[in-house]
């Protein structure tokens, strides 16, 4: 019979609201009293096993403790009533646990989507946590219609899915209902139409046609989802080139109704553009669709818009009469091209004389001329057309070019190597740059480029190496032939020299010696060599410092002691720092010649 | 030359089927968008239906959904119509034509000879 | 769906006469416009596209003019081989594409 407890605390499952307060009493029974002599004063209260001071117990009767919480602030509270029995024992009568936590908060910012092709599904903020099982109810009626209610899993307590078919054109009211032990509370009641809350499915099946009579558009088809027939539609399409990461927009106002074709304007010719679509309600009520699958599509081939940069380089050594001249033309760039080149077209003309054609895959053509006056013309072919023609004059043999550009300055900046210069008084129609590294190692072999006559600053528009020398080259182009060409050397970044010069003496006295050096190899320079400085030291002495310009290859080291040993090394230095070379010693004679002792 | 030329016309009774065909020549039809456009006897012109260049797409006016189906085949440069649940009222000359677009518009050129089709009751 | 009304449905003129016929969409149709000649037994043949451009092979004397919803085909001296029925095409919001009713011009 003591299985049974000795009393019971009311009250039996409390649920709390935080930080309120909360009063239990534990009742003792008799025969637990008259057992274990004891009575109300005897009873000891504990919270998750700790005791709770008697000065929050109140004594109501015989057979009654109660012990008060205020600001109750833990979720979870075992509480224990217990007694003292013989000898200071503690025998434990019953238990219960506090729970506490919040009562819902009116629920807020409901809103509801109807995705095509499935039920309506409606969202909201519950509010701050309860930390309390909180129930919520999406309710939803027709005004002569209830229907069943929604009851959100508890894995997403902020969203639920109606079982019902969604009927446009009749409005709806929806409201959401959130219940706990502590309360119940009810979101303001929103009424609409279905019709408005329509996420359509994207259009699909969208494709890309091109036009062989205009190279800047593409025709966009597409198949509306099927929500078309129940609403109007509007729509947005984005597209980029192929290799681009941002979108551009067609303008709304330009997609504004219901459709199933868009021609798209204003692209590059035989360019690949992607594009994707989405779609919404034409009167913007509702959400937009997802974006549809993209498409890509490429722009008919138009004409090249430019002729290709063209120049020559005539052979020196020519035959009696005659000369190897070898024309030359970069490929244009795709937006220049607009299309696949087929082919190069180039004709020759011999002062006041007869035609030469050629066509030509390759973007070079070596010609035997005459020394005479020749004009070169050349058109890049694509499918759809020729560019305009390039024209060159190869003067005759006894032209005398003139007219350089002036104050030919080159510099890196912005990790590009940039070439300036003053322009001639003359009209210049074009300029050619070229530009090669200088090696003792290989021949300069020159790349190439051209530039409208107008410009004066450019950067070179090549691969170019770090530490490396350009020599650098411009050619104002007249009508009757090259000006004199001007010359400037520039690196893109300098570096430190990759060997320092190696010293030796030129001739050592008593008191001094000559010492000499070679320049650097070019491709050891890594830059413009500025200065070099010559260290040099006794074994037991300071070593002494003395900086040298850095066209000199010689230099006197005097107030030298006689009969020593000295250590001398010398390192050349860029802009970008300094390197040594090997370290070389002499010893200076005891004796000046013909000194005796 | 471009050239379009409809085939398969004839006297069908109500409810009964149809299968028209357009045999492209002269230009690449692969490329192009096509068109079926109808007019009955004395009256205006009517577009029927639509299919994109690589048959992904097709449109159709409201009075023949459900009925119609267009289709092409791009290796014979042939579009068709079939036509199901034919009724009186679709009784016409039935025009392929080829879609050319700009960016201002899309137009129907060239039409073919046209086909008759007449429902009978 | 856009409504494309042609006025008027028909008119009598003589040969060197000048002649305008009018088209209206009930929308706002850019320059998604074009014209049709259709003569009797014959199939429509292009004359203007996108509002204003004349197609290839058609005589000059055809022009076309208008944006939006306002838009004129003119005849600027009718020749004998001119009179035929004239039909107006918006391409502007398809499906579904839409016709006028025809114009049609008869010889005086």
């Known amino acids: 019979e003591l299985l049974d407890p000795c009393g019971y605390i009311s009250p039996e499952s409390p649920v709390v609201q935080l930080h309120s307060n909360f009063t239990a009493v534990c009742v003792l029974k008799e025969k637990c009293m008259d057992y274990f002599h004891v009575n109300a004063n005897y009873i000891v209260w504990k919270t998750n096993h700790f005791t709770i001071p008697k000065e929050q117990y109140t004594i109501i009767n015989r057979t009654a403790s109660s012990v008060t919480f205020t600001d109750i602030s833990s979720l979870n509270i075992q509480l224990t009533c217990n007694i003292l029995t013989f000898g200071q024992l503690e025998q434990n009568v019953y238990g219960i646990t506090i729970i506490s936590g919040l009562p819902p908060e009116k629920p807020k910012n409901l809103s509801c989507i109807v995705n095509e092709g499935k039920k309506m599904r409606c969202e909201w903020n519950r509010g701050r946590e309860t930390h309390l099982e909180t129930n919520f109810t999406l309710k939803s009626e027709w005004a002569t219609h209830k229907f069943a209610d929604c009851k959100a899993k508890r894995d997403t307590p902020t969203s639920c899915t109606v079982d019902y078919s969604t009927v446009y054109f009749v409005n709806i009211e929806v409201w959401v209902e959130a219940e706990n032990a502590l309360g119940k509370v009810t979101s303001d009641h929103i009424n609409f139409d279905p019709v408005y809350k329509v996420k359509p499915n994207p259009p699909h099946n969208l494709s890309v046609i091109n036009s062989e009579e205009l190279s800047s558009i593409l025709k966009l088809t597409w198949t509306n989802p099927s929500i078309k027939s129940v609403i109007r539609l509007k729509y947005n399409i984005q597209y980029r080139t192929k290799d681009a990461s941002t979108w551009s927009q067609i303008p709304p106002e330009d997609t504004a109704s219901t459709r199933s074709s868009f021609t798209v304007q204003d692209l590059k010719p035989f360019t690949e553009y992607v594009f994707r679509i989405c779609c919404m309600k034409e009167d913007g009520k509702g959400y937009w669709s997802d974006w549809s699958e993209e498409a890509n599509g490429i722009t008919y081939e138009d004409r090249p818009s430019k002729a290709p940069s063209f120049w020559y380089k005539i052979d020196p050594s020519h035959a009696q009469g005659y000369r190897t001249v070898q024309l030359m033309w970069k490929t244009l760039p795709p937006f220049e091209a607009n299309g696949k080149i087929l082919d190069y077209e180039v004709t020759l003309t011999r002062w006041k004389s007869h035609l030469q054609n050629y066509t030509v895959n390759d973007t070079k053509l070596t010609v035997n001329l005459t020394n005479d006056r020749y004009v070169a013309t050349l058109t890049a072919r694509n499918l759809v057309g020729k560019s305009d023609a390039a024209v060159l004059t190869i003067p005759a043999c006894d032209f005398q070019a003139t007219h350089p550009v002036m104050d030919l300055k080159a510099f890196p900046k912005d990790n590009m190597l940039w070439v300036e210069w003053t322009t001639p008084r003359e009209s210049v129609k074009k300029y050619i740059l070229e530009w090669c590294v200088l090696s003792d190692k290989a021949p300069c072999i020159a790349d190439w480029q051209q530039e409208d006559g107008t410009v004066h600053r450019t950067h070179l528009r090549g691969n170019l190496a770090e530490s490396k020398c350009y020599l650098i080259t411009v050619t104002p182009v007249y009508a009757d032939g090259p000006g004199s060409p001007e010359s400037i050397k520039a690196y893109l970044k300098q570096a430190p020299p990759s060997k320092g010069p190696t010293v030796r003496t030129k001739k050592v006295g008593k008191n001094e010696a000559v010492l000499e050096w070679d320049q650097l190899p070019v491709d050891v320079q890594n830059g413009f060599i500025r200065n070099y400085t010559i260290f040099y030291r006794t074994i037991i002495g300071n070593e002494t410092a003395v900086n040298v310009d850095s066209s000199h290859t010689e230099y006197t080291l005097s107030s030298l002691t006689s009969d020593t040993l000295y250590m001398v090394r010398m390192a050349a230095y860029t802009d970008e720092g300094g390197k040594d070379g090997p370290e070389f010693t002499f010893t200076t004679p005891k004796f000046a010649q013909g000194e005796i002792e | 030359e471009v050239q379009l030329v409809e085939s398969g016309g004839g006297l069908v009774q109500s409810g009964g089927s149809l299968r028209l065909s357009c045999a492209a020549s002269?230009?690449?039809?692969?490329?192009?968008?096509m068109n079926w456009v109808r007019q009955a006897p004395g009256k205006g012109l009517e577009w029927v239906a639509y299919?994109?260049?690589?048959?992904?797409?097709?449109d159709y006016s409201d009075s023949v959904k459900g009925r119609f189906t267009i289709s092409r085949d791009n290796a014979k440069n042939s579009l068709y119509l079939q036509m199901s649940s034919l009724r009186v009222e679709d009784t016409a000359v039935y025009y392929c034509?080829?879609?050319?677009?700009?960016?201002?518009?899309?137009?129907?050129?060239?039409w073919g000879q046209g086909t008759l089709v007449t429902v009978s009751s | 769906d856009i409504q494309m009304t042609q006025s008027p449905s028909s008119l009598s003129a003589s040969v060197g006469d000048r002649v305008t016929i009018t088209c209206r969409a009930s929308?706002?149709?850019?320059?998604?416009l074009n014209w049709y000649q259709q003569k009797p037994g014959k199939a429509p043949k292009l004359l203007i596209y996108?509002?204003?451009s004349l197609q290839s092979g058609v005589p000059s004397r055809f022009s076309g003019s208008g944006s939006g919803t306002d838009f004129t085909l003119t005849i600027s001296s009718l020749q004998p081989e001119d009179f035929a029925t004239y039909y107006c095409q918006q391409s502007y919001s398809t499906p579904p594409i839409t016709f006028g009713q025809g114009t049609r011009l008869e010889i005086k």
């Open positions: 996108a509002a204003s």
């Open positions: 929308q706002s149709i850019s320059s998604y």
């Open positions: 299919i994109s260049n690589t048959g992904t797409t097709r």
């Open positions: 002269g230009f690449t039809f692969s490329r192009y968008e």
């Open positions: 034509v080829r879609e050319k677009f700009s960016g201002t518009s899309d137009w129907f050129d060239p």
